[in-house]
Interface confidence: low
């Protein structure tokens, strides 16, 4: 059980107040984290509260401003990047968001040696991506879908690619589907460790069908947004990987890296690139049917100036029970011999664990094991491997950081974080300096988040970087809800749940229940993290019980649970939410006439199907930006879990799993359907089709659209959305306004 800080002494009770919706919408109780921007083994940069860029040296204890807020303000900079030789800083301004990760910006280069902006050969605008080389001060940037290189900031640019074209050919940046569903970055170029080579991807979207939607703006005619967007079964982008020698870029030009034969025989994806040395690179490829992944290690051939990827350096990863990997296929972390590597994949018992691969995957040495999962490898040094897992005390929703000593035999394991601040901190991430000389730990909860700095050799805490004192003080007179994380055992399935209870919760009373669901493959909602959000308010002020349940298809509890939904989306996720609700009713404090469910995105899909399940459990529910048919969603994501929408593959379940097919079942529930009209991700089409099916079935429902808003419904739309949903729920639960 996790009890959140909440005062219950009678003397204090009259000074305590419940959370208000305004608190949530204003972000009154948001927290800060501190991630050092490491620039060496013992130095990091940080942007101070007054916007100076400050360099901290941990060993001398000294700090000094390398860039003043005045310089930042002179170009309205909102971000910066120091060149590795510390001679220049790029300043980023005019940020203009595109998709989830991508944005364009204007870049200015500031010369630290003379305190002036670099004049002459200035960068064009707007730039789609810009980065320094890992050594020195070379610049690579993407402008108008082409890649350019500068040997020094003041030099004229060398144009590497020439075929870039908006919505057609993308060089060094991903197209929509690679950005959202494969790379999860705004860039698709990678410097070699010492900056000798630059690798980049070229995405050809020429033949991809285009999603078009209206952007209303305030013009007489709406604009049409066109995005090459492959939906399930559609034609996909064609990807090629090139590498250019940045010292003599004009000498031989970009050289294409060959695709493994077993991958190239049918549709495929490129999934990631990892440099090993300046002359060795590792590429990961994936078949379109995403249960076979190939890791290919390629070497530079000086004599031919080409890249050679011998079959002996191809490592195949295959899943026989689901798709390859978790959400993505994991990436390798190479050891100092520059050929062997550490990688997370399923062991024979179906749990994701760290393996050490020296020659073949078949001969991999398992490094971690147990009925829990290794989640991320942070750093490998000569003698230590740092990783995170959910092993400690068998709570899948926790994250602790571990160190394995690989320099000694047998390797010994130590939990770095398990006992540091046990009540406050059970969910960590980490950020390491060069050679793991120092590291920062960022604790996300369940107590108030705290960031600390540690010695990489002894794990000793050096200092607190951010402890959110103001937040702690602000919460002193707030009646926060209580939270508990527990599990249900049902038919050999473990369903972990988080319950958020009103501050004066009394087991003998009856409370309305709201289920908040996401439930997408490889997701996790039940996590030991701190949050003061909309559902906190609903429990604190409106007296609701809120529950989150991780059912089949969710992550970090083994492949049996994860791959249960393979080729069958929309079945078990819904069943498990319903099962949990029945168990909650049995607990005795839920008013079974006042149960609701809500979710966003995949959660909107699950909440819609739950409402249309015909169980009579739910009085009402909300779907925000739901998927309504898997034929409408992106190929890379959808086909990973569902296969292809073809007769000889899985078309039948594509058809059976739509929300529209269950339109009749909405007759006995109150349904609120919400979507942004400019949703580039889950297209408005999804909700349009639900609405059409409900109208055709003559089923009453409520709806709200947000004009020109994307999948995030940000800005003023957020306030309107949560206010609207609050009214809907209060009406449903007969709570006075």
């Amino acid at each position: 059980i996790v009890l959140r800080p909440s005062r219950v002494h009678n003397s204090e009770e009259n000074t305590m107040r419940a959370l208000t919706l305004k608190d949530i919408l204003n972000g009154t109780f948001s927290y800060k984290t501190f991630f050092p921007n490491w620039i060496s083994g013992q130095e990091y940069l940080h942007q101070s509260a007054d916007n100076n860029i400050v360099l901290y040296n941990i060993e001398t204890g000294q700090s000094y401003t390398i860039l003043s807020n005045r310089t930042m303000k002179s170009v309205n900079a909102s971000n910066y990047g120091l060149s590795p030789d510390r001679q220049f800083v790029y300043l980023e301004s005019d940020y203009s968001k595109l998709w989830r990760y991508s944005y364009t910006a204007t870049y200015y280069i500031y010369d630290l040696s003379n305190g002036e902006f670099v004049r002459g050969n200035e960068l064009p605008r707007p730039i789609q991506y810009l980065c320094w080389s890992p050594v020195g001060s070379k610049l690579a940037y993407v402008y108008q879908n082409n890649i350019y290189l500068k040997q020094r900031p003041g030099d004229p640019p060398f144009q590497i690619t020439f075929n870039g074209r908006e919505n057609k050919i993308f060089n060094g940046i991903p197209d929509w589907v690679y950005e959202e569903e494969m790379l999860a970055t705004k860039y698709a170029l990678w410097w070699s460790p010492n900056g000798k080579f630059l690798a980049y991807a070229e995405f050809n979207d020429t033949d991809i069908p285009v999603i078009a939607y209206s952007y209303y703006g305030d013009e007489q005619y709406p604009r049409t947004i066109n995005i090459p967007y492959p939906k399930a079964g559609a034609k996909n982008p064609v990807v090629r990987i090139f590498i250019i020698d940045t010292t003599y870029p004009a000498y031989v030009g970009p050289q294409e890296v060959p695709v493994p034969a077993m991958i190239a025989s049918s549709d495929y994806y490129f999934s990631w690139l990892t440099w090993v040395t300046d002359e060795r690179v590792c590429l990961q490829w994936l078949k379109r049917v995403q249960n076979v992944s190939v890791l290919s290690i390629c070497d530079f051939r000086e004599d031919w100036q080409t890249w050679d990827c011998p079959k002996t350096q191809e490592h195949i990863e295959e899943s026989r029970t689901g798709w390859a990997g978790g959400f993505f296929v994991s990436t390798p972390v190479f050891s100092y011999d520059a050929i062997s590597y550490y990688k997370i994949f399923s062991d024979k018992d179906g749990y994701k664990h760290i393996h050490y691969i020296k020659d073949t995957v078949e001969n991999a040495i398992q490094i971690t094991s147990g009925k829990w999962e290794a989640i991320n490898i942070f750093r490998v040094t000569q003698d230590s491997l740092f990783y995170s897992s959910n092993e400690f005390e068998e709570y899948p929703g926790r994250r602790n950081i571990y160190r394995i000593s690989i320099g000694s035999y047998p390797p010994s394991k130590k939990c770095v974080t398990c006992h540091l601040r046990k009540e406050r901190c059970q969910y960590y991430t980490a950020s390491f300096s060069d050679y793991a000389k120092y590291y920062a730990l960022v604790c996300y909860g369940p107590g108030i988040p705290i960031s600390t700095l540690h010695d990489g050799r002894t794990d000793q805490e050096i200092k607190i970087l951010e402890e959110n004192k103001e937040l702690e003080n602000a919460l002193k007179n707030i009646q926060l809800p209580k939270e508990e994380i527990k599990k249900l055992e049902v038919d050999e399935i473990t369903l972990w749940y988080k319950m958020i209870l009103p501050p004066q919760f009394d087991r003998s009373k009856k409370y309305p229940l709201l289920i908040q669901v996401y439930g997408g493959p490889c997701s996790q909602s039940v996590r030991s993290v701190f949050a003061v959000n909309w559902i906190s308010y609903l429990a604190s002020k409106e007296g609701m019980v809120i529950a989150l349940v991780d059912g089949r298809g969710t992550a970090f509890q083994g492949d049996k649970l994860l791959y249960a939904v393979y080729r069958k989306l929309g079945v078990y996720e819904v069943e498990d939410q319903i099962t949990a609700v029945r168990k909650f009713i049995e607990m005795g404090f839920i008013d079974e006439k006042r149960i609701a469910i809500w979710g966003w995105s995949y959660g909107g899909y699950v909440s819609s199907l739950a409402l249309a399940s015909g169980t009579g459990l739910f009085k009402c529910g909300i779907a925000v930006a739901p998927v309504s048919s898997w034929e409408y969603y992106a190929s890379v994501y959808t086909e990973r879990f569902m296969g292809l929408p073809t007769k000889d593959d899985n078309l039948e379940h594509y058809k059976n799993s739509t929300v529209m097919a269950r339109a009749e079942y909405f007759r006995n529930v109150d349904y609120l359907l919400i979507h942004g009209t400019a949703d580039d991700n889950v297209h408005f089409q999804n909700s349009a089709q639900i609405a059409k099916a409900l109208v055709n079935a003559q089923v009453d429902f409520q709806a709200m659209w947000y004009s020109d808003q994307n999948h995030g419904l940000s800005g003023l739309s957020t306030n309107h959305l949560y206010t609207h949903m609050t009214h809907f729920l209060k009406q449903c639960f007969s709570l006075s306004d």
Partner: nanobody, 123 residues
Framework: QVQLQESGGGLVQAGGSLRLSCAAS????????IGWFRQAPGKERELVAS???????NYADSVKGRFTISRDNAEKTVYLQMMSLEPEATGVYYC?????????????????WGQGTQVTVSS
């Protein structure tokens, strides 16, 4: 589909002013970004100023503060007001249109072009 026709060019003394017009035909003119490009003798076409479908403007550094681009969607016309002209401004001025961002400066990224109008600034 849009057709573009420039006018307003001519001979002017250094320090003088000119106003170029770009008249468009086509029902969906307001959906397009419009740019003015200059091609000096023996040089590539370069973007001088552009205006998005929503009215956001963008200028080359060399003309900032002296040139003003504006659009009248009702008249289906875009204007380029050029003040304090210098001899370097001499060239053929082309009006171009594209469906999308107005910030693209490469002429190959613009879809529709007018015939051009000559501007000569004498010293």
């Amino acid at each position: 589909q849009v057709q573009l026709q420039e006018s307003g060019g001519g001979l002017v003394q250094a320090g003088g002013s000119l106003r170029l017009s770009c008249a468009a035909s086509g029902r969906t003119f307001s959906m397009y970004a419009i740019g003015w490009f200059r091609q000096a003798p023996g040089k590539e076409r370069e973007l001088v100023a552009s205006i998005s479908s929503g009215g956001s403007t963008n200028y080359a550094d060399s003309v900032k503060g002296r040139f003003t681009i504006s659009r009248d969607n009702a008249e289906k016309t875009v204007y380029l007001q050029m003040m304090s002209l210098e001899p370097e401004a001499t060239g053929v001025y082309y009006c171009a249109a594209r469906d999308g961002s107005a910030l693209y400066t490469a002429h190959s990224d613009w879809d529709y072009w007018g015939q051009g109008t000559q501007v000569t600034v004498s010293s």
